[in-house]
């Protein structure tokens, strides 16, 4: 992994004034062994609204690697294998929890952060705006 | 929120032997203001693979509430609004981090846990197994 220099301003773990802190054991209990989203299924390729997964790395975040889905088309794939622009491929978004090193570069001090990621794409009927 | 009785066996936050623990500030930095997935968009209703969102609550987990998507149909909705069973509605799954109170009922002691949640559904071409 990436070695992060220790910030001399890191808070003391025992500091009673550290705002609303808890102890978290990082030995993850993982109910799922598969960590690469591409291996979990091939839905991203077989979907009528296919997507690609983009790797994003940030050593100040835990997990440091997240994957973001990006739809391959504006439309959806029809029965003939062509893109039908009367339908829309749209990303499905999910709010997830991550740990952000705070202050930066501290090995044992984090802040919970909620971020939004796109997990995959779905095909929707477009909203048609009728002009009066 | 739910008041959880303190377990007398909770570990001391200052315990140096507590396995690979870190301090986490629970004052969440939230980049997104929208937390109810039903309000974020109506894709779950407009999708060709529509889904329902089910609320799952667990006071021993943080966040205590997560939403799970369940596809409404085995097939996908076609242009006529009927279910086409030549296509499949499938859930898009995402591995997320949650905090699990450990030991149970401890207010300030957690263990990181990875769980798999279904975020929404997408329409895929089925895998056809040809019999020789």
């Amino acid at each position: 992994g990436i070695t992060i220099p220790r910030n001399p301003g890191c808070p003391n773990s025992e500091d009673k004034n550290f705002p609303r802190t808890v102890m978290v054991n990082l030995n993850i209990h993982n109910r799922n062994t598969n960590t690469n989203p591409k291996r979990s299924s091939d839905y991203y390729n077989r979907s009528t609204s296919p997507w690609n997964l983009h790797r994003n790395e940030d050593p100040e975040r835990y997990p440091s690697v997240i994957w973001e889905a990006k739809c391959r088309h504006l439309g959806c794939i029809n029965a003939d294998g062509n893109v039908d622009y009367h339908m829309n491929s749209v990303p499905i978004q999910q709010e997830i929890l991550v740990l952000r090193r705070e202050p930066p570069h501290c090995p044992n001090s984090f802040r919970l952060e909620k971020i939004l990621v796109s997990v995959g794409c779905t095909c929707v009927t477009p909203i048609v705006h009728h002009v009066a | 929120g739910i008041t959880i009785p303190r377990n007398p066996g909770c570990p001391n936050s200052e315990d140096k032997n507590f396995p690979r623990t870190v301090m986490v500030n629970l004052n969440i930095h939230n980049r997104n203001t929208n937390t109810n997935p039903k309000r974020s968009s109506d894709y779950y209703n407009r999708s060709t693979s529509p889904w329902n969102l089910h609320r799952n609550e667990d006071p021993e987990r943080y966040p205590s509430v997560i939403w799970e998507a369940k596809c409404r149909h085995l097939g996908c909705i076609n242009a006529d609004g009927n279910v086409d069973y030549h296509m499949n509605s499938v859930p898009i799954q995402q591995e997320i981090l949650v905090l699990r109170r450990e030991p149970p009922h401890c207010p300030n002691s957690f263990r990181l846990e990875k769980i798999l949640v279904s975020v929404g559904c997408t329409c895929v071409t089925p895998i056809v197994h040809h019999v020789a």
């Epitope: 690609n52 994003n56 990006k70 391959r72 990303p91 978004q93 971020i115 939004l116 796109s118 | -």
Partner: antibody, heavy 117, light 112 residues
Framework: QVQLVESGGGVVQPGRSLRLSCAAS????????MTWVRQAPGKGLEWVAS????????YYPASVKGRFTISRDNSKNTLYLQMNSLRAEDTAVYYC??????????WGQGTLVTVSS | DIVMTQSPLSLPVTPGEPASISCKSS????????????LAWYLQKPGQSPQLLIY???TRQSGVPDRFSGSGSGTDFTLKISRVEAEDVGVYYC????????FGQGTKVEIK
């Protein structure tokens, strides 16, 4: 119709900072990745930064990494480019563009940034 | 990093005649997984912003005249104009995008 309008350009001294904005309208902003592309006077197109539709993933070329920061406010339908430690070679017209998918299907009119002492 | 090389860099054309621009990439732009070539073509008319002509190597953008066509796969791509019109003058760029973006140097098309 899709519209992208950049603002915030101007003359700035080397080493100083500038923040560009791009106001988007006519489409569901939070469904699309967005990109900044620049064009130095009389030169070709150069990629500057990209951000995912959620704002959680950002990408930069080596030429600006660590100096420029792309961000977005989906509630305001606005894309930003924070430019720090500006250099003379950053002088260019800066365009914001929508990523239709793996191509840039709509571009703004551009805003000129001049870095000069 | 992927490098995109366009040729020619300057192309004098006669209205009504065909024109062709080549774009070669240092790595394949074809993704077998998605069966797509991640290559686009743009035209930047004098004093204007670039406009998308072709994406995924051969798909014409909505509203683009059918005299424009794109072809090629892997590392070699071509943009063809079947019959050049006066309004087609400007600089043409090829572009690859996946995580990062790379543009060709541009080909300046002008009337003879």
């Amino acid at each position: 119709q899709v519209q992208l309008v950049e603002s915030g350009g101007g003359v700035v001294q080397p080493g100083r900072s500038l923040r560009l904005s791009c106001a988007a309208s006519g489409f569901t902003f939070n469904n699309y990745w967005m990109t900044w592309v620049r064009q130095a006077p009389g030169k070709g197109l150069e990629w500057v930064a990209s951000v995912s539709n959620t704002g959680s993933s950002t990408y930069y070329p080596a030429s600006v990494k660590g100096r420029f920061t792309i961000s977005r406010d989906n509630s305001k339908n606005t894309l930003y480019l924070q430019m720090n430690s500006l250099r003379a070679e950053d002088t260019a017209v800066y365009y914001c563009a929508r990523e239709g998918a793996y191509y840039l299907d709509y571009w703004g009119q551009g805003t000129l940034v001049t870095v000069s002492s | 990093d992927i490098v995109m090389t366009q040729s020619p860099l300057s192309l004098p054309v006669t209205p009504g005649e065909p024109a062709s621009i080549s774009c070669k990439s240092s790595q394949s732009l074809f993704w077998s997984e998605s069966h797509m070539n991640y290559l686009a073509w743009y035209l930047q008319k004098p004093g204007q912003s670039p406009q998308l002509l072709i994406y995924y190597a051969s798909t014409r953008q909505s509203g683009v005249p059918d005299r424009f066509s794109g072809s090629g796969s892997g590392t070699d791509f071509t943009l063809k104009i079947s019959r050049v019109e006066a309004e087609d003058v400007g600089v043409y760029y090829c572009h690859h995008h996946y995580d990062s973006h790379t543009f060709g140097q541009g080909t300046k098309v002008e009337i003879k």
